[in-house]
């Protein structure tokens, strides 16, 4: 399986709230030995390896964000932890899975990344992840409402 | 923040089985693999297996014949059961939590296990 | 099975010295590496997750680097506490294997 993400660039203004999203493609197996780790982080575009460093998003590291679930299962992560962060991560029954962040500031702008991890019961363990940038933005160039544009092309779409 | 503690003989037969028990608190069974990894006097680290909160579990072949590994989440503790013991058994037991895709990031302060009759 | 070859398998060194420290795979493990420090009667701790990171807690003076087979632990100035035994372990298949472990006593 791989992740997709379909916005590659999120600009969105101070003060408002914003929804990460990626989506797991292919074939996902959904028997019952088979369970999915998912979570979320900051990091950096490193050298080596995107996504390799695991930062915390405001102060809430991939463990505290991370959702667990069969292949059947949407799932949430703790809620009482990750809104008091302002922060929300979910997963639906169709491989979309998200993180919000309300009341953004400066201090959130960055890369963000969502990591899949496949358990599955004797095998060695399969993880994918995907990257995509956060732009807070504040002053009269910034835009009203969050604008997000695709990975594949450049064409933006505004978001409220 | 999560601590593991582990209990269990600290002496056992040849031919015998071997029990421990991990106890997990300050966090969630749910969130990790739970691995154990012995050390044998003077000697380098050696994974025996792990389970994960879902039942799954994954074993060191050398040693699967003779290892099962289960966990109860009420009681937040899981167990390693080593079968037909020998002295080459004989080896510090340490119970570890391993986040997937990372690391082995908490540790238990180990047990020393000696085979002898 | 993915052997790891730790070498040296012993460092003398003095405290304020560049300590390097060398991993060898028996084929890729990508970036999915990990290095562990063990003192004496303690349970080793994590260093370095994915060859390069620092895990949470641990100074800039360690630092991770390699990519595939061959792996480098570098502590960059010895302090006091940081002679002790050093394992590398791979995480891209199972079993999980550790390295021998590379021990850097005080010369």
């Known amino acids: 399986f791989k992740v997709a993400t379909p916005y590659s660039l999120y600009v969105c203004p101070e003060g408002q709230q914003v929804t990460l999203t990626c989506r797991l493609l292919g074939p996902v197996d959904k028997g019952h030995d088979v369970t999915f780790y998912k979570t979320w982080y900051r990091s950096s575009r490193g050298e080596v390896q995107t996504c390799s460093e695991r930062r915390p998003i405001r102060n809430l590291t991939f463990q505290d964000l991370h959702l667990h679930h069969g292949g059947h299962q949407a799932a949430n992560t703790s809620h009482d932890l990750a809104q008091r962060h302002g922060l929300e991560s979910a997963s639906d029954h169709h491989g979309q899975f998200s993180i919000t962040m309300r009341n953004l500031t400066l201090l959130d702008s960055g890369l963000y990344c969502c990591l899949v991890v496949e358990i599955r019961h004797h095998h060695s363990e399969h993880r994918v992840h995907g990257a995509m940038e956060l732009q807070v933005q504040t002053g009269k160039d910034a835009p009203s409402n969050c604008v997000v544009y695709p990975s594949s092309s450049q064409d933006s779409e505004n978001i409220t | 923040q999560v601590q593991l503690q582990e209990s269990g003989p600290g002496l056992v037969k040849p031919s015998e089985t071997l029990s421990l028990t991990c106890t997990v608190s300050g966090g969630s069974i749910s969130s990790y693999y739970w691995s154990w990894i012995r050390q044998p006097p003077g000697k380098g680290l050696e994974w025996i297996g792990y389970?994960?909160?879902?039942?799954?579990?994954n074993y060191n072949p050398s040693l699967k014949s003779r290892v099962t590994i289960s966990v109860d989440t009420s009681k937040s503790q899981f167990s390693l059961k080593l079968s037909s013991v020998t002295a080459a058994d004989t080896a510090v037991y340490y119970c570890?939590?391993?986040?997937?895709?990372?690391?082995?990031?908490?540790w238990g302060q180990g047990t020393m296990v000696i085979v002898s009759s | 099975e993915i052997v790891l070859t730790q070498s040296p398998a012993t460092l003398s060194l003095s405290p304020g010295e560049r300590a390097t420290l060398s991993c060898r795979a028996s084929?890729?493990?990508?970036?999915?590496l990990a290095w562990y420090q063990q003192k004496p009667g303690q349970a080793p701790r994590l260093l370095i997750y994915?060859?390069?990171n620092r895990a949470t807690g641990i100074p800039a003076r360690f630092s991770g680097s390699g990519s595939g087979t061959d792996f480098t632990l570098t502590i960059s100035s010895l302090e006091p506490e940081d002679f002790a035994v050093y394992y590398c372990?791979?995480?891209?298949?199972?079993?999980?294997?550790f390295g021998g472990g590379t021990k850097v006593e005080i010369k």
């Open positions: 994915d060859a390069f």
């Open positions: 372990q791979q995480r891209i298949n199972w079993p999980l294997t």
């Open positions: 389970i994960y909160y879902s039942g799954s579990t």
């Open positions: 084929q890729s493990v990508s970036y999915y």
């Open positions: 570890a939590s391993d986040i997937p895709a990372f690391a082995f990031d908490i």
